[in-house]
C-alpha cells in the first residue's frame, strides 16, 4: 500500500525552499528493497526535469520555477519497483497543484469597442458588453474582473454606466439626444483582484452612436405664401417651399412629405418633394381657368416619410402654412368647343341645304364670337360651303354618286375661324355620314324618334342635334371637355349625334 | 502505430475452459500495464483483470480464482485464461492497454465469448 | 451492484450543450482521477477524457471533463449526429482494489 503526501507549489518563484514538496513510500519496503521511479510532463516529458525523486527515499524536489499558466498542476506517476524492475504496487498518479499569483493583467477582446443605442432610449437600457479575460486561475480574486468608466467624451453629464462585473454598458437616464451629441466616447478600465488597489488593470474606448429617431416635428420656413399664376398654363417651379427638421439628415426622419389640407380640390397643383434638400416644389399640373377662379387659397400641412417617435406623438399639431394664388387673366380669344363635330347628310339633300353650325366660342366670355370670320380649310370633293359670319355650314350641291364613292361615304373636313384682332386661327373638325346614296329615305330622321342624350334625358322631337365632345387643339393650349353636355341645339333635321 | 489483435472466442459449455490471446504492435507488452474488460449483450463495460508485473495482477471479484491473466514478451502476447466459465461469463471480452496515465487508452477488436449448454 | 452511477440516457439537440454525470464514493471517484470513454454502437469504446479532464490527441475541444469531490462530469458542447454514443465513466476504487467502470449513458440527439 502506498503512502504519500504532497504539497503544492507556487508559481513565479523558487520552490526549493519547500522541498521535498512530495513524498512517497510503499510498505513493500518493510521486506524487500524498493526503488521509486517516477514519470510524467515535467519529469520526463517536456518541459523535463522540473521534478526529481531521491529512488530509494521516495523523496520528490522540485527544481526550477513553473508557471502555473502554462501548467496549473503536474500529474506525477509513481512506481514502486522490485529489485528486476517488477512493479510491487498498482502505479500511484499524485497531483503537484501550482498556486496561482497575480502575474497577468486583464486583456479586453478588442482595442475599441463600437456600440449604438437609439436616442430618447429608457434608462437602464443596454447599450453593449464589454469583454475581457484574465490568464489567471478562474474563479480566483487574480481573474476577477471589476469593470469601471473612467472618462466620457462629451463629459457634460454621465449617460452611461458599467456592471462592474459583467461589462455591460447601460443607460443611465433617458436623456440621450441625438440633436445635441451624435457620439459619444467612453474610456472603459478593468481591474483584477476585484477592482482591488493590488490589481492589475487594463483600459479600452468604446465608441457609442446614438441613433435618430423621429423626434423633431418639421415645420416650413414660412406660415403664409403669395403667387400668381397665369391662367392655361403648366408650371413645374411654382413656388420652392423649404422645411426646416433638426432629425437625422437625409433619414425618413428627417425627410418631409408637403400635402394638401385644402384649396386643392381641382386637383391644379402638385408638390414634389426634393430629398436631398428637404425643399417642396408646387407644380400646376392642371391649367387653372380665370373664368371660373379668379383666387384660391391653398392650405398644406407637413409631416415626415417616418412615423413620429412616441416621445413627441402627443406634441404634434397640424400646423396648416397658407398659400393665396392669384390667378391671371389670359386674353384667349375664340375656339371651338368641342373642336369636333359629326353631321349625317341624307342622299334627298341638295345645293344649299343646311347641314350644321359650326361656331367658335369666346373663351373670355364663354360666348359665341362676334369678332371672328369662317372660312372652309380643308374641303374633300368641294361639299361644303360656310357662312363666314355665322359659321352656318351648307351643301354646295346634291351629293354625285361620284363624290359619295370618292368619300367612301364619309366626309373629314376642317372649319377656320380667323380673329383679326388677335391674329389668331382655330380649327374645328368636321365629320359627315352620307347615307343611303340614290335612296330617298330620310333615314334616322322619322318624327318622334326617341332618342335618350347623355344627361339621361329623353327628347320626342322631328329635328335633332348632338355634338359630339372630342379634344380641340389651339396653338397654346389642351383643353378636354367633358361629354354629357346633352342636347344644347336643336337644329335642322339633318344633324346626328355621334360619329 | 498501436494495435491489438485479438484472438480465442467460442463457443462453450458451461464449466468448460478457453484461452484468450491479445497480440500488440507499436509497443512492448511488458512496457505496458494490459487489462482486459468485458461486456455482456445489451450491457455496459465491466473490468476483468490487470497485470501490472510478473508478481502484480488485481482481478474482478466476479472472475477471482477462476481467472488468470499472463504476458508473453518474446510474442509480445497478453492471455487471458478462463476456466469454470459459467453463463454469466458470456460477452465481448476485449484486451486493452493501460498506458503510463493509468488509462486505458487503446482497446482490441473485442471477441465473442459464449458460455451455453 | 455498480459502483459509480451515471443516468441510463441523455438527449439533446444539435448545437445543445450536454452533460452527463458520474456519482461515486470516497474509495473511488474521491481518492482517484476519472477517465471517460465514447462507444459507437458495435465498435470497441474509445478514451475521450483521462485524469479528469485531459483530452486526448485527436478528440475534439467539444468535449470537457471536470471532478469535484467524489462526482464527475462530462460536457459535450456544440452536439452533433455523429455524438450519438454510449458514454462510461471509470476509474480505480481503493477498496475493492479494481476498476470501476458507470453503467454508461446512451446520448441521444434529436
Known amino acids: 500500500e502506498w503512502i504519500k503526501f504532497a504539497a503544492a507549489c507556487r508559481e513565479g518563484e523558487d520552490n526549493s525552499k519547500r522541498n521535498p514538496i512530495a513524498k512517497i513510500h510503499s510498505d513493500c519496503a518493510a521486506n524487500q528493497q524498493v526503488t521509486y521511479r517516477i514519470s510524467g510532463v515535467g519529469i520526463d516529458q517536456p518541459p523535463y526535469g522540473i521534478f526529481v525523486i531521491n529512488q530509494k527515499t521516495g523523496e520528490i524536489n522540485i527544481t526550477s520555477i513553473v508557471d502555473r499558466e502554462v501548467t496549473p498542476f503536474f500529474i506525477i506517476y509513481c512506481r514502486a519497483l522490485n529489485s528486476m524492475g517488477q512493479d510491487l504496487e498498482r502505479p500511484l498518479e499524485l497531483r503537484v497543484r501550482v498556486l496561482d499569483i497575480n502575474d497577468n493583467p486583464p486583456v479586453f477582446s478588442m482595442a475599441t469597442f463600437a456600440g449604438q443605442i437609439e436616442e430618447n432610449s429608457n434608462a437602464n437600457t443596454l447599450v453593449m458588453i464589454l469583454n475581457a479575460t484574465d490568464a489567471d486561475e478562474p474563479n480566483n480574486l487574480n481573474s476577477k474582473i471589476a469593470f469601471k468608466i473612467i472618462r466620457q467624451e462629451p463629459s457634460d453629464s454621465p449617460m452611461f454606466i458599467i456592471n462592474r462585473n459583467t461589462g455591460e454598458i447601460r443607460t443611465m437616464n433617458n436623456f440621450l439626444d441625438r440633436e445635441q451629441y451624435g457620439q459619444y466616447a467612453l474610456a472603459v478600465r478593468g481591474s483584477d483582484r476585484d477592482g482591488g488597489a493590488d490589481g492589475m488593470s487594463a483600459e479600452c474606448e468604446c465608441n457609442i452612436k446614438i441613433l435618430d429617431v423621429n423626434d423633431n416635428i418639421p415645420y416650413m420656413e414660412q406660415s403664409s405664401y403669395t403667387i400668381e399664376i397665369q391662367e392655361n398654363t403648366l408650371n413645374s417651379n411654382l413656388l420652392e417651399i423649404r422645411v426646416i427638421d433638426l432629425d437625422e439628415e437625409f433619414s425618413a426622419n428627417w425627410m418631409a412629405v408637403i400635402f394638401f389640407i385644402s384649396g386643392n380640390e381641382g386637383n391644379w397643383f402638385e408638390i414634389e418633394m426634393n430629398e436631398r434638400t428637404n425643399v417642396g416644389i408646387l407644380k400646376v399640373v392642371k391649367p387653372l381657368d380665370y373664368e371660373a377662379m379668379q383666387s384660391l387659397q391653398l392650405s398644406i400641412g407637413v409631416r415626415n416619410k417616418a412615423e413620429f417617435h412616441h416621445s413627441i406623438m402627443s406634441q404634434y399639431k397640424l400646423k396648416a402654412s397658407a398659400i393665396s394664388v392669384t390667378v391671371l387673366n389670359v386674353i384667349e380669344g375664340p375656339v371651338f368647343r368641342p373642336g369636333s363635330k359629326t353631321y349625317v347628310v341624307t342622299g334627298n339633300m341638295g345645293s344649299n341645304d343646311k347641314v350644321g353650325d359650326f361656331v367658335a366660342t369666346d373663351l373670355d366670355t364663354g360666348r359665341p364670337s362676334t369678332t371672328v370670320r369662317y372660312v372652309m380649310g380643308n374641303n374633300p370633293a368641294d361639299l361644303l360651303a360656310v357662312d363666314s359670319r355665322t359659321g352656318k355650314l351648307t351643301l354646295k350641291n346634291k351629293v354625285t354618286k361620284e363624290q359619295y364613292n370618292m368619300l367612301g361615304g364619309k366626309y373629314q373636313g376642317t372649319i377656320l375661324s380667323i380673329d383679326d384682332n388677335l391674329q389668331r386661327t382655330c380649327t374645328g373638325t368636321i365629320n359627315i355620314n352620307i347615307q343611303s346614296f340614290g335612296n330617298d329615305d330620310r333615314t334616322n330622321t322619322e318624327p318622334n324618334t326617341k332618342i335618350t342624350t347623355n344627361t339621361g334625358r329623353q327628347e320626342s322631337t322631328s329635328s335633332t342635334n348632338y355634338d359630339t365632345s372630342t379634344t380641340s387643339t389651339d396653338s397654346s393650349q389642351v383643353y378636354s371637355s367633358e361629354p354629357g353636355n346633352g342636347a344644347k341645339d336643336l337644329l335642322s333635321d339633318n344633324v346626328h349625334f355621334g360619329p | 502505430q498501436v494495435q491489438l489483435v485479438q484472438s480465442g472466442g467460442d463457443l462453450v459449455q458451461p464449466g468448460g475452459s478457453l484461452r484468450l490471446s491479445c497480440v500488440a504492435s507499436?509497443?512492448?507488452?511488458?512496457?505496458?500495464?494490459m487489462s482486459w474488460v468485458r461486456q455482456a449483450p445489451g450491457k455496459g463495460l465491466e473490468w476483468v483483470s490487470t497485470?501490472?508485473?510478473?508478481?502484480?495482477?488485481y482481478y474482478g471479484d466476479s472472475v477471482k480464482g477462476r481467472f488468470t491473466v499472463s504476458r508473453d514478451g518474446s510474442k509480445n502476447t497478453v492471455f487471458l485464461q478462463m476456466s469454470s466459465l459459467k453463463g454469466e461469463d458470456t460477452a465481448v471480452y476485449y484486451c486493452?492497454?493501460?498506458?503510463?496515465?493509468?488509462?486505458?487508452?487503446?482497446w482490441g477488436q473485442g471477441t465473442l465469448v459464449a458460455v451455453s449448454s | 451492484e455498480l459502483v459509480l452511477t451515471q443516468p441510463p440516457s441523455a438527449s439533446g439537440t444539435p448545437g445543445q450543450r450536454v452533460t452527463i454525470s458520474c456519482s461515486g464514493s470516497?474509495?473511488?471517484?474521491?481518492?482517484?482521477?476519472v477517465n471517460w470513454y465514447q462507444q459507437l454502437p458495435g465498435t470497441a469504446p474509445k478514451l475521450l477524457i483521462y485524469?479528469?479532464?485531459q483530452r486526448p490527441s485527436g478528440v475534439p475541444d467539444r468535449f470537457s471533463g471536470s471532478k469535484s469531490g467524489t462526482s464527475a462530469s462530462l460536457a459535450i458542447s456544440g452536439l452533433q449526429s455523429e455524438d450519438e454514443a454510449d458514454y462510461y465513466c471509470?476509474?480505480?476504487?481503493?477498496?475493492?482494489?479494481?476498476?470501476?467502470f458507470g453503467g454508461g449513458t446512451q446520448l441521444t440527439v434529436l
Open positions: 486493452a492497454s493501460e498506458g503510463g496515465g493509468l488509462t486505458i487508452d487503446y
Open positions: 471509470a476509474t480505480w476504487d481503493d477498496s475493492l482494489n479494481g476498476r470501476v
Open positions: 470516497s474509495s473511488n471517484i474521491g481518492s482517484n482521477t
Open positions: 507499436g509497443f512492448n507488452v511488458n512496457d505496458n500495464y
Open positions: 497485470i501490472y508485473s510478473e508478481t502484480l495482477s
Open positions: 485524469s479528469n479532464n
